[in-house]
Interface confidence: low
């Protein structure tokens, strides 16, 4: 039976329950590497606290669908009599990245997983030519998620003091010329993920191999490499290579760029401070505040919850936008879809789409940019289910007693993005991390 | 009737080459993200070659750099060209088809053998 997903193939990837200390190692294609859990397992699951292994799935025991894979095992976990044996369930649903497999629930039996990836997409517009795994687990079973920072066009321009060279990089996959063709970037050759341009010419200095990899609990690293022999005529001989660390600052701090902190042969070191290294749960959460010895801010966006089933509306062009931020109150133009964001046609009101639902909400505050995303929509063409991202602005003399109205920015491959100038954007800082 | 049809295979010394064919009907070709796969004796199938419906390509680490994919929307085809061939490239190679309306569609194999 052929590999259901060839893309995700190449590595083993990690999971974790936070709740009861298990880390997960997923190979959908083969088996983990690991002798505990036996030559077959796919899903192996490492208990910290008893400081035992169990495979909970195995690879000869695949079953696949377009948006499936279960492993089942030959262990009865004996429910009641029945003849149920333990296995692993992984949802894949369309994403915009590789992205990374989570851990939502373990019954007696099954391990659940959802895993929002391109390899699940029924096109292929976010498919990558390379792209490697871009989260980490820290010694303390805490995640650090690079894939915000992946540009799915376009690349990033490293902070460098030559002024005849310009390098460009994306993070954990190759720059996407052909989506964005800048006018810098239209030369560099595909596959590249650190482009070096110099006058005219483009030359791809470096390509993703492995994951990235944590070094200390606050410096994750990246190592590209020019794949092909081949010299450089400029690099003396050496195959150019990149290597990009990114450190969590040490408090709460706005965006920098990637920095150029060395070069010889070929050889670039970059550094690049940004929050997006920092564990997830210093960045996020699933409701709409942010507070807590582990934020250090304090932010809280539910009093722009709306009641009374009134919505705000954001104007598109050709479509309305009823939002519902912050709560579970449903938009009465959205049937029923469980909507915090609401997308109707302006020229037929019964074409009506979720552009995200109120219980798939993510609060972000990182790098000093407040974002609400609700994602889980309706489904478009390419299987990516339709999301939005809120970008919210501190505005102190905003009106609707302060809580100011979402504005409509554009959309890009089934995402909405707004912006919304409130004071209840105003973040408090606590020093202290 | 939506149809793949692998042709190309035979036999070929090692260091050799071929090109095998799959010729699509039924389908709007240049929707179809294009991929080949190949099976030998006794193992599982693996993934060799993956051509996305906007051009992009990849490879499986074991024939980079000495098999190419590529494709032509006028007849409807795409090909896998294959040099440098090794004995353990010997398998049945199969084309698919992953449109984003159907679900996926298989050929039915075509034999490469690399023997001296």
């Known amino acids: 039976q052929a590999a259901p997903f060839p893309e995700l193939c190449s590595y083993t990837w990690e999971a974790v329950d936070t709740k009861n200390n298990v880390l997960y190692k997923i190979n959908i294609c083969g088996s983990v590497d690991i002798v505990q859990c036996g030559p077959s397992s796919a899903v192996c699951m490492h208990d910290l606290k008893t400081r035992t292994y169990h495979s909970v799935g195995d690879s000869v025991l695949r079953s696949a669908t377009r948006s499936l894979l279960e492993f089942n095992t030959t262990v009865s976990c004996d429910q009641q009599g029945t003849n149920h044996r333990v296995q692993s369930s992984i949802a894949f649903l369309c994403g915009k990245t590789l992205g990374t497999p989570e851990f939502v629930t373990a019954t007696f039996c099954v391990h659940y997983f959802e895993w929002r990836t391109t390899a699940a997409c029924k096109k292929d517009i976010f498919k990558a030519n390379k792209e490697v795994p871009c989260y980490v687990f820290d010694e303390e079973l805490r995640k650090h998620d690079l894939n915000p920072l992946i540009k799915l066009s376009g690349a990033y321009l490293v902070d460098d003091s030559d002024p005849d060279t310009s390098l460009f990089i994306n993070v954990c996959r190759d720059i996407d010329t052909l989506r964005d063709p800048g006018s810098q970037l239209r030369a560099c050759p595909p596959g590249t993920a650190a482009c070096l341009v110099r006058g005219h010419q483009a030359f791809d200095v470096g390509q993703p191999r492995d994951g990235l990899k944590v070094v200390r609990k606050d410096r994750l690293v990246l190592s590209y490499v020019r794949e092909e022999a081949g010299k450089l005529d400029f690099c003396d001989g050496h195959s150019p290579a990149v290597t990009i660390t990114f450190v969590c600052p040490s408090e709460r701090r706005e965006g920098t760029i990637p920095k150029l902190t060395a070069k010889s042969n070929c050889r670039y070191e970059i550094e690049w401070i940004t929050e997006y290294a920092c564990h997830r749960d210093y960045l996020e959460s699933k409701t709409c505040s942010l507070s807590g010895e582990q934020q250090d801010v304090s932010i809280d966006l539910t009093p722009l919850a709306q009641s009374g089933g009134s919505s705000y509306i954001s104007d598109g062009k050709e479509y309305l936008f009823y939002l519902n931020v912050c709560g579970e109150t449903e938009i009465q133009f959205c049937n029923k879809k469980q909507a915090a964001v609401c997308q109707v046609k302006k020229s037929d009101t019964s074409q009506v789409k979720a552009a995200g639902r109120y219980h798939n909400q993510t609060l972000r505050y990182s790098d000093g940019d407040l974002t609400l995303i609700y994602f889980g929509g309706d489904e478009c063409s390419s299987g990516f289910q339709r999301m939005s991202v809120i970008n919210f602005e501190c505005n102190k003399t905003a009106g609707n007693d302060g809580k100011g109205t979402p504005v409509f920015t554009g959309e890009v491959d089934c995402t909405y993005f707004f912006t919304w100038d409130t004071e209840y954007a105003c973040v408090h800082h606590h020093h202290h991390h | 009737q939506v149809q793949l049809q692998e042709s190309g295979g035979g036999l070929v010394q090692p260091g050799g080459s071929l090109r095998l064919s799959c010729a699509a009907s039924?389908?709007?070709?240049?929707?179809?993200?294009m991929d080949w796969y190949r099976q030998a004796p006794g193992k599982q199938r693996e993934w060799v070659a993956t051509?996305?419906?906007?051009?992009?390509?990849t490879y499986a680490d074991s024939v980079k750099g000495r098999f190419t994919i590529s494709r032509d929307n006028t007849k409807n085809t795409v090909y896998l060209r294959m040099n440098s061939l090794k004995p353990e490239d010997t398998a049945v190679y199969y084309c698919?088809?992953?449109?984003?309306?159907?679900?996926?569609?298989w050929g039915q194999g075509t034999q490469v053998t690399v023997s001296s």
């Open positions: 051509l996305a419906s906007y051009g992009w390509k």
């Open positions: 039924g389908i709007i070709f240049s929707d179809n993200r």
């Open positions: 698919k088809a992953s449109s984003p309306v159907l679900n996926d569609i």
